[in-house]
Interface confidence: medium
């Protein structure tokens, strides 16, 4: 099935900004929202954002979760508010590494 | 067995400098998150700093920010805290933490949480004229 | 940052007692992220409990936690004469991390 091509006039979307990209700012708008999590040095680093450009989301959303990163992307006014993305996890549960929100 | 060792402390005028040395043991020191924690005399815990396995990602408490710097050497097995422009109130214990960030086999994380399983004894740090 | 309020600041309990400490986070933090300690006059803090519920290994069954949300709780179902100390909850829900002010069990 051939992937969806973006309309000519795209609909933008009010996004949750959180993370170093954002500046001053507690929101974005832009195409796509985003919620992120990545381990950096032993780290949890949190990031919610927005695609400006369809092309910018269209292989980070599909991106399946790894163990080092995970991307949510949704579509819709403040859709990513209440999304936390979550790593695979595997087998018995250990201690996890330290969480940062980089705001 | 399982040990953290602070070093360093002492008695030091306002304005002045200390580094403070913990040294790990027991562990595979690399694999590890390290925390600074503080205790003034009489008071309660206070978070002061916390650094990365391979030290490149730190972060610090408000109260410290610009003045302390965490760093850490895997080779030697130790943590360090370099405390410049010292205040009567960064007198404190001093402890240095261990965060078990314990990871799968597979590479799979868990997540998130986390809080610090190994305490050294302390260093008192005085900061007096 | 997110306060966290420890009650009672201190209590005076007989060895056999159950005794219960509250602490309170100023917004909302996921169980995984409250943490109790213990120390002792003189010493490092012990860990107790992770993950707001989770006994750390090496920890008498007679300690516990509960909670969510805003609200949790450390028990001592009987108190032991070893038991005798400040205990500190710990939030890591978002750096930088914050700790309790302690509350100071002693002897009646």
């Known amino acids: 099935m051939e992937d969806e091509k973006p309309k000519v006039n795209p609909k933008l979307y009010m996004c949750v900004c959180e993370g170093l990209s954002c500046g001053n700012e507690d929101h974005c708008e832009g195409q796509q929202c985003f919620s992120s999590l990545s381990i950096n040095d032993g780290f949890h680093v949190y990031q919610k954002g927005c695609f400006q450009v369809y092309e910018q989301g269209k292989m980070t959303c599909k991106t399946p979760p790894s163990p080092g990163q995970a991307v949510e992307c949704c579509q819709g006014d403040w859709c990513n508010r209440n999304i936390t993305a979550q790593l695979p996890t595997k087998g018995k549960s250990f201690p996890g590494t330290q969480n940062f929100h980089l705001e | 067995e399982v040990q953290l060792l602070e070093s360093g402390g002492g008695l030091v005028q306002p304005g002045g400098s200390l580094r403070l040395s913990c040294a790990a043991s027991?562990?595979?020191?690399?694999?590890?998150?390290m925390h600074w924690v503080r205790q003034a005399p009489g008071k309660g815990l206070e978070w002061v700093s916390v650094?990365?396995?391979?030290?490149?990602?730190?972060y610090y408490a408000d109260s410290v920010k610009g003045r302390f710097t965490i760093s850490r050497d895997n080779s030697k097995n130790t943590l360090y805290l370099q405390m410049n422009s010292l205040r009567a109130e960064d007198t404190a214990v001093y402890y240095c933490a261990r965060e078990p960030g314990y990871y799968y086999p597979s590479g799979y994380y868990r997540g998130p949480g986390y809080w610090m399983d190994v305490w050294g004894q302390g260093t008192l740090v005085t900061v007096s004229s | 940052d997110i306060q966290m309020t420890q009650s009672p600041s201190s209590l005076s309990a007989s060895v056999g007692d159950r005794v219960t400490i509250t602490c309170r986070a100023s917004q909302g933090i996921s169980g995984n992220w409250l943490t109790w300690y213990q120390q002792k006059p003189g010493k490092a803090p012990k860990l107790l409990i992770y993950?707001?519920?989770n006994l750390q290994s090496g920890v008498p069954s007679r300690f516990s936690g509960s909670g969510s949300g805003t609200d949790f709780t450390l028990t001592i179902s009987s108190l032991q004469p070893e038991d005798f100390a400040t205990y500190y909850c710990h939030q890591s829900y978002r750096g930088p991390m914050t700790f309790g002010q302690g509350t100071k069990v002693e002897i009646k």
């Open positions: 027991g562990f595979t020191f690399g694999r590890f998150v």
């Open positions: 650094i990365g396995y391979s030290g490149s990602s730190t």
């Open positions: 993950d707001a519920s």
